[in-house]
């Protein structure tokens, strides 16, 4: 038997993926465990193999269909179970009744690009990936810019309280290398959290013209 505190957290990407992390103090690293998904109003089930991500935590992705298919709705409830093999039997280690649209975490924004850059400002655009059409425009974004000599953690957060897939960065220093990241969050869902940060976009402001300040 496995003792110790257990934590089982899952998020729905709003389309066809449920990502889960299970942590268990004192669990054996070589134990074979799975996540089983049983929707209440669907005829399908799904399983994924939990793989170790640290000393006492495992993760897996339940692939429900193609990335752009709408496999669950706000009225679905999915029973999620962690099952671990003990000899020839499977033992249930954790269970939750999962409401997908209360536990959202979207994919990181993609296709970041510089639309226009000047000496002191830069216009950047991006796209959201695999986000349900249910949200319509009910999304918000956070963005941050990495300046020379600073860390990402020190970068001030800029909040966009609407579905706006572009930003104009201002008061930048001429001829300077910057990096930019953005993340997205639906307004819906009690336990909804921010997406991962996008891949950083590197850009350089234009040099100041000679003879001008």
């Amino acid at each position: 038997a496995v003792n110790g505190t257990s934590r089982f957290t899952c998020f729905y990407n709003s389309r066809a993926n449920i990502s889960c992390v299970w942590s268990q103090d004192g669990a054996l690293q070589d134990t074979s465990c799975q996540v089983h998904a049983w929707p209440d109003r669907r005829r399908w089930n799904q399983t994924c193999e939990l793989l170790p991500v640290s000393q006492a935590s495992w993760a897996c992705n339940l692939i429900l269909g193609t990335p752009d298919s709408q496999k669950l709705t706000a009225v679905d409830i999915v029973t999620l179970r962690v099952m671990c093999r003990e000899g020839v039997r499977w033992r249930m280690m954790a269970i939750q009744d999962f409401k997908p649209f209360e536990n959202l975490r979207l994919m990181a924004p993609i296709s970041l690009q510089v639309v226009h850059v000047e000496t002191h400002r830069c216009n950047i655009s991006w796209k959201i990936s695999q986000a349900s059409h249910y949200f319509e425009r009910h999304l918000e974004f956070e963005a941050r810019t990495l300046s020379p000599g600073h860390t990402w953690e020190e970068a001030p957060l800029m909040t966009l309280k609407q579905k706006q897939e572009w930003i104009c960065l201002e008061t930048l220093t001429p001829d300077t290398q910057y990096e930019f990241q953005v993340r997205v969050k639906p307004l819906q869902g009690e336990f909804t959290t921010w997406s991962p940060w996008s891949q950083p976009l590197a850009f350089r402001t234009k040099p100041a013209a000679l003879g001008k300040d």
Epitope: D68, S69, Q70
Partner: nanobody, 116 residues
Framework: QVQLQESGGGLVQAGGSLRLSCVAS????????MAWYRQGADNQRVLVAA???????AYGDSVKGRFTISRQNARNTVYLQMNSLKPEDTAVYYC??????????WGQGTQVTVSS
Amino acid sequence: QVQLQESGGGLVQAGGSLRLSCVASGSVSSINGMAWYRQGADNQRVLVAAISRVGNTAYGDSVKGRFTISRQNARNTVYLQMNSLKPEDTAVYYCNADSWGGDDYWGQGTQVTVSS
């Protein structure tokens, strides 16, 4: 409503091949993704392969590299080419369609039996 009709199942030797077909009729304009699921002795209906309207695909781990899903939108048909079949592929194979609204539609199923 969407109706789905599968065909192509049967008995095959291990290592052999089969091609399943599924024809959709009815409100086909509402269909987004189409997929094949299978239900074996454990009674779980799990994803085998899925394909979106624009051709993105997803496969279950146990069939990757052996099964190929394809779709002919003009014919409202989805196919599952199954190669290097194994006895553990024995199951009832169901065609599935999901709508933009998140509804699921199912065929009646076709039996695939792989003998060793």
